[in-house]
Interface confidence: low
């Protein structure tokens, strides 16, 4: 790889490797390996074994580290208002008398007038304002499927508020549903968490705009405090470049590995603790893929001559638009590793080890 | 500012500013700025404003920008699992003929032997191995309180499987306000999700230890595989140096701004529109605090002669262990923005725009 | 307390020139729009023209449009009204008035007004 | 003509409750611009009452309440007194207009 100068990847991998040593001692706070003379003889007990593998074992429901934000999300979103139906439709009668829940109705042509086709979506949110109130409450929100069933989108623990709130709830994938289902009225539910063995199931929430007998719920205040769906999409005009050649990659381990990319990139650096670092401390892993950042990204001066053409790199040379930007990670992950202290085995997990993807910065 | 070649601010703000101008055209996917020539006089639309302000405000329920790592998390956690109580325990007995959960009970007095005080805790997962099943179903779970009521914690939306699988629920704040009520038993409960107006109240998950008439739930295999909480801590001895002089500080405004920090850190920098771009097309806001980072972020020889205080530093310069570690943005916000487009006014909202904290990476 | 205080109107021929003064006090001056109105004798009231906070940008009514010029200045706090080649149909009590929020079109405070009569 | 329409004149005895309406169109009140109430008593300069349509400016008593719904704002005074006698004003930006703002004709409040 060359930026201005020729980059002598041997030393980079060396420093590199010297870090990871540094590293790993600063984050188990030690001045120095530790002494391997009271170490059982044979393997590992099946107890530690089976609390690294937990450790390292990605489960369902554990986040995983947030991936790389997609082209699409560098660029502009346009942002558009949904009020949800006028309370006084018809549709809204069934739902009069129920009392663990409000129903809010939107139109689908309304939100398609907003984001003519499903994949331009980048954000929707249903927000609604909660009157002020002395009760706590868990609530649920519900989306319509076919016929009378609800699909639970998610919930919330409302505590007393002296001033009404906005809360807010993300309904991207419901509304990108609803955009692919044609025209028509799609439904919400706003209901009460009801226990299996509580009797209470009444909403105590008000929200402004649809709860009744609220004064001053007229007008424009009414109108602007009504439930609604705030939009984010890439307008279609813009949407079309999205598609073209010059789009911006993922720079991680399946890009990054198998290209020539000279500008920033993740490169690959397997770490043996015996052979690299000289230690036998670490009982396990034997090693880890640490792999590092590598690449010139170029500064545009925005002053170019082609600048149509300068812009386009934005996105991939410069996102945030540092004055000196750098190549550093993006996504990264932790290790577990097994070690003993005296003749105890011990079980750590070390934070933000491996790299992963790299960004320009 | 100084490093090895004194920094000219005034041109690295030049240069920030001249980046900002072409990244904004960019998000916009603008090659120029657009003309303002049909932009009508007078004041934005009530509804532009509207929009323009939701955008602008945090609401309950969103999610902000994920905080920097405390200085704790950079240290290495030691891991450690304690088993649920044993199911032949008397206090199992009053919860075997309820259908809609299942209970699982945690002796305190274990969970602090692996954490003796609450701070330390870093995360504590509960987790537990669903048996192969051919239903869907929503279950939550739920943290005994007081007397016989019980505080929701999660919920999961479980598909069908073909072979066990482990679930993980995040209960890291139940497990520290376990820690801080003294010793004793402390309970969990995982039931069906009960809407208001279903019938059908029963849990048909099944979970390994639990769940009862499975063969093969005897001896290790069952003691392995019953539900247990992973516990992530911060080991005593180690916890001390976190209050020692030589802590890790969050390089972001509250700091950088009010200090004289030569070292990596968030600078002031905020962007009048008209002033520095030139700009009239942006219609709200007039400017915004861009910000940008600034410093050296020295690379530390791990073979350092002063190797104990050379570790020290790790933790601040370099972190991620790089081999040219190099000071970038860590949390940034978008900005929204009002212009026009002929006639038509547009709120959009442009990504990590505002640069509020910074890390050597 | 947010004082605005007009001067410079008067009696002028038909085709003369008059400059109105505005002299603002108790409010920060360059953060603020403002606009003339006037009120003709019995009549209602009409927005002649409005300056942007930092004197960028001017909007006039199509009846005063081309003979009318309004500026500002903002070390001064002051606000002028230049009005060329008048006719007998701008005789009227004008008043400034400040906007309620930055370029709002609401005007939350006014001045007392000066009369301009123009006749031969 | 006035593009905000009012009626010239309106009447009412202390104690009562009137309703002053402006109608526009949706390039100003229908097109969610801010739309304001001014009140001008006999010989002094006009102040605001109401502001964006609902809200009330500060020292204007609550007996004055401001809405709008479409292209009809309505300006409604509930307890009138003897001292509400005035000209009444509404105003909006218009964006159909190369004038930029304008005001209605005027409603002229007489107490019994």
């Known amino acids: 790889l060359s930026t201005c100068k020729t980059i002598d990847m041997e030393l980079v991998k060396r420093k590199r490797i010297e870090a990871i040593r540094g590293q790993i001692l600063s984050k188990l706070r030690l001045a120095s390996p530790p002494s391997q003379g009271e170490v059982p003889p044979g393997p590992l007990p099946e107890a530690v074994l089976a609390l690294y593998n937990s450790t390292r074992d990605r489960v369902a429901g554990e986040s995983a580290d947030p991936e790389p934000e997609p082209e699409a999300d560098y660029y502009a979103k346009e942002v558009t208002r949904v009020l949800m139906v006028d309370r006084n439709n018809a549709i809204y009668e069934k739902t009069k008398d129920i009392s663990h829940s409000i129903y809010m109705f939107f139109n689908t042509s309304d939100i398609r007038e907003a984001v003519p086709e499903p994949p331009l979506l980048s954000r929707a949110e249903l927000r609604l304002q909660r009157l002020k109130s002395s009760v706590e409450q868990h609530v649920e929100l519900y989306q319509k499927y076919s016929n009378n069933s609800w699909r639970y989108l998610g919930n919330r623990l409302l505590t007393p508020t002296d001033t009404p709130e906005w809360l807010s709830f993300d309904v991207t994938g419901v509304v990108r549903q609803w955009l692919n289902q044609g025209d028509g009225i799609q439904g919400a539910r706003f209901s009460a968490h009801c226990s299996c063995d509580s009797k209470d199931n009444k909403l105590h929430v008000e929200i402004n705009g649809i709860s009744p007998k609220r004064r001053g719920d007229l007008g424009t205040i009414h109108d602007m405090n009504r439930p609604f769906l705030l939009l984010m999409a890439t307008p279609l005009e813009r949407a079309q470049h999205l598609h073209s050649s010059r789009h911006r990659r993922a720079l991680d381990t399946n890009y990054c590995f198998s290209s020539t990319e000279k500008n920033c990139c993740v490169r690959q650096l397997y770490i043996d603790f015996r052979k690299d670092l000289g230690w036998k401390w670490i009982h396990e892993p034997k090693g880890y893929h640490a792999n590092f950042c590598l690449g010139p990204c170029p500064y545009i001066w925005s002053l170019d001559t082609q600048y149509s053409k300068v812009l386009a790199l934005y996105n991939q040379h410069n996102p945030g638009a540092s004055a000196s930007p750098c190549c550093v990670p993006q996504a990264l992950e932790p290790l577990p590793i097994v070690y003993y202290v005296g003749r105890k085995p011990k079980v750590e997990q070390l934070s933000n080890m491996i790299v992963r993807s790299c960004k320009c910065s | 500012l100084s490093t090895c070649k004194t920094i000219d601010m005034e041109l690295v703000k030049r240069k920030r500013i001249e980046a900002i101008r072409g990244q904004i055209l960019s998000k916009l996917r603008l090659a120029s700025p657009p003309s303002q020539g049909e932009v009508p006089p007078g004041p934005l639309p009530e509804a532009v404003l509207a929009l323009y302000n939701s955008t602008r405000d945090r609401v309950a329920g969103e999610s902000a920008d994920p905080e920097p790592e405390p200085e704790a998390d950079y240290y290495a956690k030691e891991v450690t699992r304690v088993l649920m109580v044993d199911r032949n325990n008397a206090i199992y007995e009053k919860t075997k003929d309820i259908s809609h959960s299942i209970y699982m009970f945690f002796n305190t007095s274990d969970i602090r032997e692996a954490v003796p005080e609450p701070p330390l805790l870093s995360r504590a997962e509960l987790r537990l191995q669903r048996l192969k099943s051919s239903v869907e179903q929503h279950v939550e779970l739920y943290q005994k309180y007081s007397n016989n009521s019980w505080r929701y914690l999660g919920n999961r939306l479980l598909t069908p499987t073909d072979t066990p699988e482990w679930l993980s629920f995040d209960v890291t704040g139940v497990v520290r306000q376990w820690l801080n009520q003294g010793d004793g038993i402390q309970g969990a409960r995982f039931s069906a999700h009960c809407s208001c107006d279903s019938k059908d109240n029963k849990l048909h998950v099944e979970i390994n230890g639990i769940s009862p008439k499975r063969r093969g739930d005897l001896g290790t295999i069952h003691d392995m595989n019953r539900p247990f909480l992973l516990l992530m801590a911060t080991p005593l001895e180690r916890a001390q140096h976190l209050h020692s002089s030589r802590h890790r500080r969050a390089l972001d405004t509250n700091y950088c701004f009010s200090s004289t920090e030569k070292n990596c850190c968030v600078r002031q920098l905020y962007i009048d529109f008209r002033k520095d771009l030139g700009w009239k097309w942006i219609h709200e806001p007039k400017g915004y605090h861009a910000n940008f980072c600034l410093g050296p972020c020295p690379y530390i020889w791990s073979l350092d002669t002063q190797y104990s205080k050379v570790l020290a530093l790790y933790n601040q310069h370099n972190p991620g262990a790089s081999a040219s570690p190099c000071c970038v943005p860590q949390a940034l916000e978008p900005l929204p923005i009002v212009y026009y487009v002929g006639r038509k006014p547009k709120v959009e909202q442009l990504s990590n725009m505002i640069v509020r904290s910074c890390k050597c990476s | 307390e947010v004082q605005l205080v007009e001067s410079g109107g008067g009696l002028v021929q038909p085709g003369g020139s008059l400059r109105l003064s505005c002299a603002a006090s108790?409010?920060?001056?360059?953060?603020?729009?403002v606009h003339w109105v006037r009120q003709a004798p019995g009549k209602g009231l009409e927005w002649v023209s409005h300056?942007?906070?930092?004197?960028?940008?001017?909007y006039y009514a199509d009846a005063v449009k081309g003979r009318f010029t309004m500026s500002r200045d903002n070390g001064k706090n002051t606000l002028y009204l230049q009005m060329n080649g008048l006719k007998s149909e701008d005789t009227a009590v004008y008043y400034c008035?400040?906007?309620?929020?930055?370029?709002?079109?609401?005007?939350?405070?006014w001045g007392q007004g000066t009369q301009v009569t123009v006749s031969s | 003509l006035p593009v905000l329409t009012q009626l010239s004149s309106m009447s009412g005895s202390p104690g009562q409750t009137v309703t002053i309406t402006c109608t526009g169109s949706?390039?100003?009140?229908?097109?969610?611009?801010?739309l304001s109430w001014y009140q001008q008593l006999p010989g002094t300069a006009p102040k605001l009452l109401i502001y964006?349509?609902?809200n009330r400016a500060s020292g204007v008593p609550n007996r004055f309440s401001g809405s709008k719904s479409g292209n009809l704002a309505s300006l409604t005074i509930t307890g009138l007194q003897a001292e509400d006698e005035a000209d009444y004003y509404c105003?909006?930006?218009?964006?159909?207009?190369?004038?930029?703002?304008?005001f209605g004709g005027g409603t002229k409040l007489t107490v019994l």
């Open positions: 008035a400040k906007d309620r929020i930055r370029s709002s079109y609401e005007y939350d405070s």
């Open positions: 108790g409010f920060t001056f360059s953060n603020y729009g």
């Open positions: 300056i942007s906070a930092a004197g960028i940008s001017r």
């Open positions: 949706s390039s100003n009140i229908g097109g969610g611009y801010y």
């Open positions: 964006n349509a609902n």
């Open positions: 105003g909006c930006y218009d964006s159909s207009l190369s004038t930029g703002y304008v």
